[in-house]
Amino acid sequence: AAIGSCSKEYRVLLGQLQKQTDLMQDTSRLLDPYIRIQGLDVPKLREHCRERPGAFPSEETLRGLGRRGFLQTLNATLGCVLHRLADLEQRLPKAQDLERSGLNIEDLEKLQMARPNILGLRNNIYCMAQLLDNSDTAEPTKAGRGASQPPTPTPASDAFQRKLEGCRFLHGYHRFMHSVGRVFSKWGESPNRSRR
């Protein structure tokens, strides 16, 4: 739940959600630093860093949901992302090890900032859900597969496979956030009307 008063203005809140998803779909915030830290920044390895189909809801799936269903799915998916991020963070090298390997501390900081960034977005999603619940016309909730458990780590044979799994997951996350941004951009001017 959000702390502090949520904005009561639909257009303001929608604008805030669009700004946040716009910033978060960007691979420089998560995927690229992860690739550099894990030593996967090689063209041949990057080819293997492609999302597993079905790991995240597709844009088509997201577009097919009602607004409430979309927010529920988004919230649940981001919940799973937070769990997986915690798992990835535990496996990252420590700051002093990075320095010794001549890698950029800033990459580690970017990865650490991902969690609060997602928490912030989720709080605004909560605010928008509240606002829609209080708006005049109810719309049937058509929830998606929800979390679809995006990232259950496959039993990896070794550390390298785990790194690739993390890479694929983050690739999928950014693609998902891009889709989320596109869906938000199609939302109408008022909470009572959809332009879908």
Partner: antibody, heavy 119, light 113 residues
Amino acid sequence: EVQLVQSGAEVKKPGESLKISCKGSGYSFTSYWISWVRQMPGKGLEWMGIIYPGDSYTRYSPSFQGQVTISADKSISTAYLQWSSLKASDTAMYYCARVPVSPAYLDYWGQGTLVTVSS
Amino acid sequence: DIVMTQSPDSLAVSLGERATINCKSSQSVLYSSNNKNYLAWYQQKPGQPPKLLIYWASTRESGVPDRFSGSGSGTDFTLTISSLQAEDVAVYYCQQYYSTPLTFGQGTKVEIK
């Protein structure tokens, strides 16, 4: 309406401690980061650091690391900037500003708190 | 740290004329994977806090008059006020958010000639 309201001007002596505040309203305080920015008299803007009030995750500019402490109390939607021992060179206007995602642009600013340090 | 350098330090422009401010970054703030420039512009009027005008180098913040426009890519950026109004007298700052620490240009003071 989004607002960041900062505490009033302060006049302090060198060596004294100080904590200034920035209260957010009109939006969910834990949906954003808060940055602090210094503006010395007649000078430009300097980024000091940033905090996510949801879990108090904090990052400082290397220039300000160890010089100030940034904190937040999400229960009262307030962020803080504090000094344990002020210097005359800390005399400046201090702004808090809201940041949608870190790092990014600063989309709403507080009115500023003028801190004067003089013996 | 990325160093931001603005030019000129100040300029005087007649009402209704065009004002152009330049900003140069010490390294590119263009991210190739999404082709976006991590650059913002702010306006600070005397005795007031800064106000966000433009982000992503060219996207106007909600409520900002369309006489303000941003352009440029990589390391070279421009803020243009197409027809200067009396209320535009202010100091203008560019800021990069490509990496931390966030850094600002030194500011450009715009006055009326």
